[in-house]
């Protein structure tokens, strides 16, 4: 049961994380005009990975896409690439993890196959989360560098007669969304990897074990219920021994003392 919960929770957390990475990538507010210590303007500038926007105090908002590819800074291209790689890996990870979920039954898929798929999706989520965190961090570093450069020459002009206010940019909402989303995807991936360990079947190569419980002689052959979904209260999926019933999850997760006779 704990394995199913860990796997399910890992899937949900990763799903939220990847949705957040997609949202952050699409958001326009990666950098926003710094309003602190600046003259009060009737225009607010903000920029995303794909376009820059201007919101006037009149309420009118105008956005312009970056229609050039070669004219863009290499760092911005790198951030775009990292975010897209993160999304692609995350999407593939989600697809793989759906089939790996213990609560979903697909034909006669072996537990070992589900374990491998869970591990694969977990690794994909971890890499996806790291890509998003790296992308956002690179952009944030770029902003910090530009911020202090523009602060150094905040006002430029001819002999101080005519001043030009240089627009400074600070962290936008998308950066925080990206960091949180990347972190969630990373956590989800780790949870999937942990769940994978619990899913891997016991490698015990014995044919049969004789049990002697309550005066009854029961011959028990292990490994006969691999196709079980773990859903519901189907009694034929429960193994009865030593006077108690355990589900398949519990048998795999917590081997009884009789397994080592």
């Amino acid at each position: 049961m704990a394995v199913t919960a860990c796997q399910g929770l890992g899937f949900v957390v990763s799903l939220i994380g990847i949705a957040g990475i997609i949202a952050a990538t699409c958001m326009d507010q990666w950098s926003t005009q710094d309003l602190y210590n600046n003259p009060v303007t009737a225009v607010f500038n903000y920029q995303g990975l794909w376009r820059s926007c201007v919101r006037e105090s009149s309420g009118f908002t105008e956005c312009r896409g970056y229609f050039t590819l070669l004219g863009l800074p290499a760092m911005l291209q790198a951030v775009r690439a990292l975010m897209i790689v993160g999304i692609v890996l995350g999407a593939i990870g989600l697809l793989v993890s759906i089939f790996a979920l213990k609560c979903i039954r697909i034909g006669s898929m072996e537990d070992s196959a589900k374990a491998n798929m869970t591990l694969t999706s977990g690794i994909m989520f971890i890499v996806s989360g790291l890509c998003a965190i790296a992308g956002v961090s690179v952009f944030a570093n770029m902003l910090v560098t530009n911020f202090w450069m523009s602060t150094a020459n905040m006002y430029t002009g001819m002999g101080g007669m005519v001043q030009t206010v240089q627009t400074r940019y600070t962290f936008g909402a998308a950066l925080f969304v990206g960091w949180v989303a990347g972190g969630l995807t990373l956590i989800g991936g780790v949870m999937m990897c942990i769940a994978c360990r619990g899913l891997a079947p016991e490698e015990t190569n014995y044919k049969a074990v004789s049990y002697h419980a309550s005066g009854h002689s029961v011959a028990y052959k292990p490994g006969g219920f691999k196709a079980s979904t773990g859903f519901g209260s189907n009694t034929k999926n429960k193994k009865i021994y030593d006077g108690g019933a355990r589900t398949e999850d519990e048998v795999q997760s917590y081997p009884s003392k009789h397994d080592y006779v």
């Epitope: 003259p39 009737a42 500038n45 201007v54 006037e56 105090s57 009149s58 009118f60 627009t167």
Partner: antibody, heavy 117, light 113 residues
Framework: EVQLVESGGGLVQPGGSLRLSCAAS????????MSWVRQAPGKGLEWVSS???????YYLDSVKGRFTISRDNAKNSLYLQMNSLRAEDTAVYYC???????????WGQGTLVTVSS | DIVMTQSPDSLAVSLGERATINCKSS????????????LTWYQQKPGQPPKLLIY???TRESGVPDRFSGSGSGTDFTLTISSLQAEDVAVYYC?????????FGQGTKLEIK
């Protein structure tokens, strides 16, 4: 057709108060940024105050703390509460709608405020 | 505060002739985000409220005759009336729409010579 009609102007003594109203028809005021602009007799235009989305307000330094811009969405009206009036506040007060480029495209006919003892 | 200085204070031009009014701001009104200049031109006739002519320094408001044109960038701007008509007699104002307070120029009175 868009119409802005100011009212509430008149003669007031220095230190007195007055509340100007701007009733709009043809537009929903709540969806636009609005401004008050004044013009002293025989003088040029002077921006006084603006209210933008989210109820954020801006004021001319000389009226800050004395004037308050507000709007009533239900009545589709804009207001300018003027307290501690001075002789230099004497002017025709116009309300206007902000447009692209923060330009003022629709103006009322104005209401005269005279501050005199 | 941004100081807007118009020149000349008054101008007399013959009908059909070109009229040019200048406006200079103490700080650049060019927004780097959209490369637009936040300068507006208004026309005010006696006893009337101002009328919007040009915004973003060069964009003509709908309904404004094409003889009116705006140009300039940064701190120096110009309003040009290519062929003066009798109805163009008015006071013209430029306005900074970039920095609060949204200051106006002192106005230029245009008359017929």
């Amino acid at each position: 057709e868009v119409q802005l009609v100011e009212s509430g102007g008149g003669l007031v003594q220095p230190g007195g108060s007055l509340r100007l109203s701007c009733a709009a028809s043809g537009i929903t005021l709540s969806t636009y940024a609005m401004s008050w602009v004044r013009q002293a007799p025989g003088k040029g235009l002077e921006w006084v105050s603006s209210i933008i989305s989210g109820g954020i307000t801006y004021y001319l330094d000389s009226v800050k703390g004395r004037f308050t811009i507000s709007r009533d969405n239900a009545k589709n009206s804009l207001y300018l509460q003027m307290n501690s009036l001075r002789a230099e506040d004497t002017a025709v007060y116009y309300c206007a709608r902000k447009y692209h480029g923060n330009a003022l495209d629709y103006w009322g006919q104005g209401t005269l405020v005279t501050v005199s003892s | 505060d941004i100081v807007m200085t118009q020149s000349p204070d008054s101008l007399a031009v013959s009908l059909g002739e070109r009229a040019t009014i200048n406006c200079k701001s103490s700080q650049s009104l060019l927004n780097s985000g959209n490369q637009r200049n936040y300068l507006t031109w208004y026309q005010q006739k006696p006893g009337q409220p101002p009328k919007l002519l040009i915004y973003w320094a060069s964009t003509r408001e709908s309904g404004v005759p094409d003889r009116f044109s705006g140009s300039g960038s940064g701190t120096d701007f110009t309003l040009t009336i290519s062929s003066l008509q009798a109805e163009d007699v008015a006071v013209y104002y430029c306005q900074n729409n970039y920095f609060y307070p949204l200051t106006f120029g002192q106005g230029t009175k245009l008359e017929i010579k």
